[in-house]
């Protein structure tokens, strides 16, 4: 969002009346409250970055993210017999992605039509709430998954049912936390009419009267509490995991698991570098600049960073692939247009393969041989 200028003589409270049209005069409208943006922001709002690049990225995210996360959720809920903690966290991750991605057609249409929101205030708030909710949910569930992966290596034996219940409890707590922290995004009016551009923006312009200081404090708090702290936990878990893997015994099976673990670590690292770090950093910098200078010089970068943050919905399926054997099977077969049942029937006679699958449990369980959650 950029800072808009509220031209209302009434001023504006945190949840006040922002814009409205009183009557039409000629070809234009007479607005009761009006917001003005600086020229650079206007050029971004009307330029190819927001009207071409963003819709392309969001279309890719929608086309890839919807089926892959949909399939993942289906696999974790109906095709995975043992609901291990990792499966629970991944199911929640897939659900978070789906809840965000399903609104993307509206987002795509909004940008294609020159950043003009025609779907009403409520839908804009839902879109924004789910957008940020997904990012912070992804960070937290990824952290849980990472810590859990490490914990399995350190403590391979444990009560599965108890662990699953804990994972469910943690997941519910995360959803509740995200619901609470995103309340301001649902409460604050997000749509604003810009008379100079003749468009109604959704979240892209917020008035200066919205108390930019509050927005800065809000995103700074989220960046510290829901990004930096979980990022530190995730990094610690993977550093310790790499150490453990280095010192573990080196048979063929362990080597496979190690490679998969490294792929998982690289995927999560890529997600942090592409999706989470730029967006959280630029959210803070952007609002700091508005708070201190009244305008943001990083607006274009901020827009791109937020756009890239949605790529986590495309990267998450790779995490499922490296962690879940069931998802890996279904993904391979979906890509090869085969049914899992057919493949399993083919495998019945091959006892050696069957045995190897029982013992290769990193993917759905841990990084040590023949251990479960």
């Amino acid at each position: 969002t950029i800072q808009g200028t509220n031209r209302s003589s009434k001023g504006r409270s945190l949840i006040g009346k922002v814009d409205g049209t009183s009557h039409v005069t000629g070809k234009g409208v007479t607005v009761e409250t009006v917001f003005s943006v600086d020229e650079f922001s206007a050029s971004v709002l009307t330029g190819k970055l927001t009207t071409v690049f963003l819709p392309i990225v969001y279309t890719i995210v929608f086309v890839v993210g919807l089926p892959s996360n949909g399939m993942a959720l289906w696999v974790f809920l109906f095709r995975t017999k043992k609901k291990h903690p990792a499966v629970i966290y991944m199911a929640n991750l897939a659900l978070a992605d789906l809840l965000s991605v399903i609104w993307f057609p509206l987002k795509i249409a909004y940008h294609i039509h020159g950043n003009n929101w025609i779907y009403g205030e409520a839908l804009c708030n839902v879109l924004i709430g789910f957008f940020y909710g997904n990012m912070y949910c992804s960070i937290l569930f990824m952290t849980c998954l990472s810590v859990q992966r490490y914990w399995v290596i350190v403590n391979p034996m444990g009560h599965s049912r108890k662990k699953a219940n804990i994972a469910i409890g943690i997941s519910l707590a995360i959803w509740l936390l995200i619901l609470l922290v995103t309340i301001p995004l649902y409460v604050v009016k997000q749509t604003i009419f810009i008379p100079a551009l003749n468009i109604t923006t959704c979240h892209d312009v917020l008035p200066e009267q919205l108390l930019v200081g509050d927005m800065f404090n809000y995103f700074l708090s989220l960046a510290i509490g829901v990004f930096l702290f979980p990022a530190f936990l995730t990094a610690s878990a993977y550093v310790l995991m790499i150490r453990m893997l280095r010192s573990s015994a080196m048979d063929e099976n362990s080597e496979k698991k190690r490679k998969r673990a490294i792929k998982l670590i690289v995927t999560v690292l890529a997600m942090y570098l592409i999706c989470f770090t730029p967006s959280n950093l630029l959210l803070v910098v952007h609002y700091f600049l508005i708070k201190s200078q009244g305008q943001s010089h990083v607006y274009a970068l901020y827009i791109v960073a937020l756009c890239l943050s949605t790529l986590n919905s495309c990267i998450d399926p790779f995490v499922y692939y490296f962690v879940s054997h069931d998802f890996r099977d279904h993904a391979k077969n979906a890509l090869l247009c085969r049914s899992v049942r057919t493949v399993k029937q083919m495998q019945v006679s091959l006892t050696s393969k069957k045995h190897s699958r029982k013992s290769s449990s990193y993917s759905s369980s841990s990084t040590t041989v023949k251990t479960s959650y």
Epitope: G4, T5, N6, R7, S8, S9, G11, T25, G26, K27, G28, V29, T30, V31, S36, V37, D38, E39, F40, A42, P195, A196, N198, E208, Q209, Q293, G294, Q295
Partner: antibody
Framework: QVQLVQSGAEVKKPGSSVKVSCKAS????????ISWVRQAPGQGLEWMGV???????YYAQKFQGRVTITADESTSTAYMELSSLRSEDTAVYYC?????????????WGQGTLVTVSS | EIVLTQSPATLSLSPGERATLSCRAS??????LDWYQQKPGQAPRLLIY???SLATGIPARFSGSGSGRDFTLTISSLEPEDFAVYYC????????FGGGTKVEIK
């Protein structure tokens, strides 16, 4: 060069309306906004309203319901009509060019039109 | 509504002297403040925009400074044609003008 030429002085009766014109040259009305500012004798400047190049308008709360700003792109002319005139509306009315964005000032002004409201 | 208070109301100076005009906003307006000069019977003329940017064709003796709530227009050395009324105007939230400062010959 950029110029804003306003219509001549007007004497009006209380309760009537006045329509002041502002002819633009040297730039396109579709790319700029025109703001209207008034100045009562011996007083300061008071902002009244604005019309953007796309036809959207916004008026100061004080004048809402009494002022109407329009523009005719074909003649490059902006108009400001003030109705229900009172003696306190006696002032010099100025039109000013504005780029329409937050970081722009009113860079060019018309010469002003004196409107006298007297019975 | 943001209120702009200009001080002093009148400034009596001689040509060649330095003039310092002040404009204080009732709330933070960042750098969104412009300065105008108005001579009797004439329209206002833009001098400074966005607190410190010099408008086209304005002599370098005019300079602006400040941000937030306090702003200053400085005329380094007064020329005879500089004696006029100066207005500040904010465009952060609405468009409002200050009451003006009259710079007169001492």
């Amino acid at each position: 060069q950029v110029q804003l030429v306003q219509s001549g002085a007007e004497v009006k009766k209380p309760g009537s309306s006045v329509k002041v014109s502002c002819k633009a040259s040297g730039f396109s009305l579709s790319s700029y906004a025109i703001s209207w500012v008034r100045q009562a004798p011996g007083q300061g400047l008071e902002w009244m309203g604005v019309i953007w190049g796309n036809g959207n308008t916004y008026y100061a709360q004080k004048f809402q319901g009494r002022v109407t700003i329009t523009a005719d792109e074909s003649t490059s002319t902006a108009y400001m009509e003030l109705s229900s005139l009172r003696s306190e509306d006696t002032a010099v009315y100025y039109c000013a060019r504005w780029r329409g964005f937050k970081d722009y000032p009113f860079d060019y002004w018309g010469q002003g039109t004196l409107v006298t409201v007297s019975s | 509504e943001i209120v702009l208070t200009q001080s002093p109301a009148t400034l009596s100076l001689s040509p060649g002297e330095r003039a310092t005009l002040s404009c204080r906003a009732s709330q933070n307006i960042y750098k969104w403040l412009d300065w105008y000069q108005q001579k009797p019977g004439q329209a206002p003329r833009l001098l400074i925009y966005n607190a410190y940017s010099l408008a086209t064709g304005i002599p370098a003796r005019f300079s602006g400074s400040g941000s937030g709530r306090d702003f200053t227009l400085t005329i380094s050395s007064l020329e005879p044609e500089d004696f006029a009324v100066y207005y500040c105007q904010q465009h952060n939230s609405g468009w409002t003008f200050g009451g003006g400062t009259k710079v007169e010959i001492k």
